[in-house]
Interface confidence: medium
Amino acid sequence: LGCDLPQNHGLLSRNTLVLLHQMRRISPFLCLKDRRDFRFPQEMVKGSQLQKAHVMSVLHEMLQQIFSLFHTERSSAAWNMTLLDQLHTGLHQQLQHLETCLLQVVGEGESAGAISSPALTLRRYFQGIRVYLKEKKYSDCAWEVVRMEIMKSLFLSTNMQERLRSKDRDLGSS
């Protein structure tokens, strides 16, 4: 990605998805009535013109928000503590890598303004998730719906990262 972001960042992202998958406590089919469209802002991760600063900031904000969401007393009561601890550790490592990267990307002169809008959009999206959990009184089904939603949005975000990496490889080989 043109900065000191370790090659294993993609692996760490996949590990986060694996952990979220393992955290499942009840069948999603028991929670169909609790489903909610949180309207993940897909336009942020689906574009073909991917800027490094944009990708970094989306991933950083995404991970920061996931960390914040699963780093509360409410989530400690809802999930397996060992898996939760592994999730926190993995997210923390990824965030540290991305912060180093982000500062370098901004230093290289990529628009810092381009970095703020995804952050704002994602914060609003996660606020909606928090409102939903509160509305549902942090029920097991509400947390299950949220776990599934986070997996979906994280998958889309890491796909975006892979597309940027592929683009960089193509440019490097041409």
Partner: antibody, heavy 123, light 112 residues
Framework: EVQLQQSGGDLVKPGGSLKLSCAAS????????MSWVRQTPDKRLDWVSI????????YYPDSVKGRFTISRDNAKNTLYLQMSSLKSEDTAMYYC????????????????WGQGTSVTVSS | DIVMTQAAFSNPVTLGTSASISCRSS???????????LYWYLQKPGQSPQLLIY???NLASGVPDRFSSSGSGIDFTLRISRVEAEDVGAYYC?????????FGSGTKLEIK
């Protein structure tokens, strides 16, 4: 007690530069996003810039983009606003403000404001 | 940019009676997440602004429950149920839905 102590305001000529400071105390500065907001002589409030807690994200409205730079030193608990190519329309009282980001809500409401520092751009 | 519109002055009110201050945005501030990103600030004479209301209807810490706010997404009203002398000042609405964040021009609360 949360406090935001501002300094650096002055009378400056058009085209000149100025650096404002905002020293924070009474809270964990590195955990909060911060903004600069100015109040023009006609008492209008005009949002000038934002910086997130770690300093990774910044944003400026078009009126100041390319001329103003917001930065922070979390080790010194201080927020800065570097202003250059100043114009007469930049004349205002400048306030630093803390974003209410408690409880994981990441709200951008400004819950604490500094006392303000006056910037006058005039020849 | 989202434009926030306010009248310069409120209708003069008598102490102890209720007052209403209006604000209108050029775009709905209701996000798809169900939150309305409308805020109210009060600037008392000679002081810095202070937060009164966040996300349209939530009272900020330390704000007396004489204050309340409601709205439709575009039209908003701040109500003070029993006006006190210390409520005098300029009331600003603001939006944090989109960058750049914008403020209304402020409404001065007038006491009869």
């Amino acid at each position: 007690e949360v406090q935001l102590q501002q300094s650096g305001g002055d009378l400056v000529k058009p085209g000149g530069s100025l650096k404002l400071s905002c020293a924070a105390s009474g809270f964990t500065f590195s955990s909060y996003g911060m903004s600069w907001v100015r109040q023009t002589p006609d008492k209008r409030l005009d949002w000038v810039s934002i910086i997130t807690s770690g300093g990774s994200y910044t944003y400026y409205p078009d009126s100041v983009k390319g001329r103003f730079t917001i930065s922070r030193d979390n080790a010194k608990n201080t927020l800065y606003l570097q202003m250059s190519s100043l114009k007469s329309e930049d004349t205002a009282m400048y306030y630093c403000a803390r974003h209410a980001e408690g409880g994981g809500n990441y709200d951008y409401a400004m819950d604490y404001w500094g006392q303000g520092t006056s910037v006058t751009v005039s020849s | 940019d989202i434009v926030m519109t306010q009248a310069a002055f409120s209708n003069p009110v008598t102490l102890g009676t209720s007052a209403s201050i209006s604000c209108r945005s050029s775009k709905s501030l209701l996000h798809s997440n169900g939150i309305t990103y409308l805020y109210w600030y009060l600037q008392k004479p000679g002081q810095s602004p202070q937060l009164l209301i966040y996300q349209m209807s939530n009272l900020a810490s330390g704000v007396p429950d004489r204050f309340s706010s409601s709205g439709s997404g575009i039209d908003f009203t701040l109500r003070i149920s029993r006006v006190e002398a210390e409520d005098v000042g300029a009331y600003y609405c603001a939006q944090n839905l989109e960058l750049p964040f914008t403020f209304g021009s402020g409404t001065k609360l007038e006491i009869k």
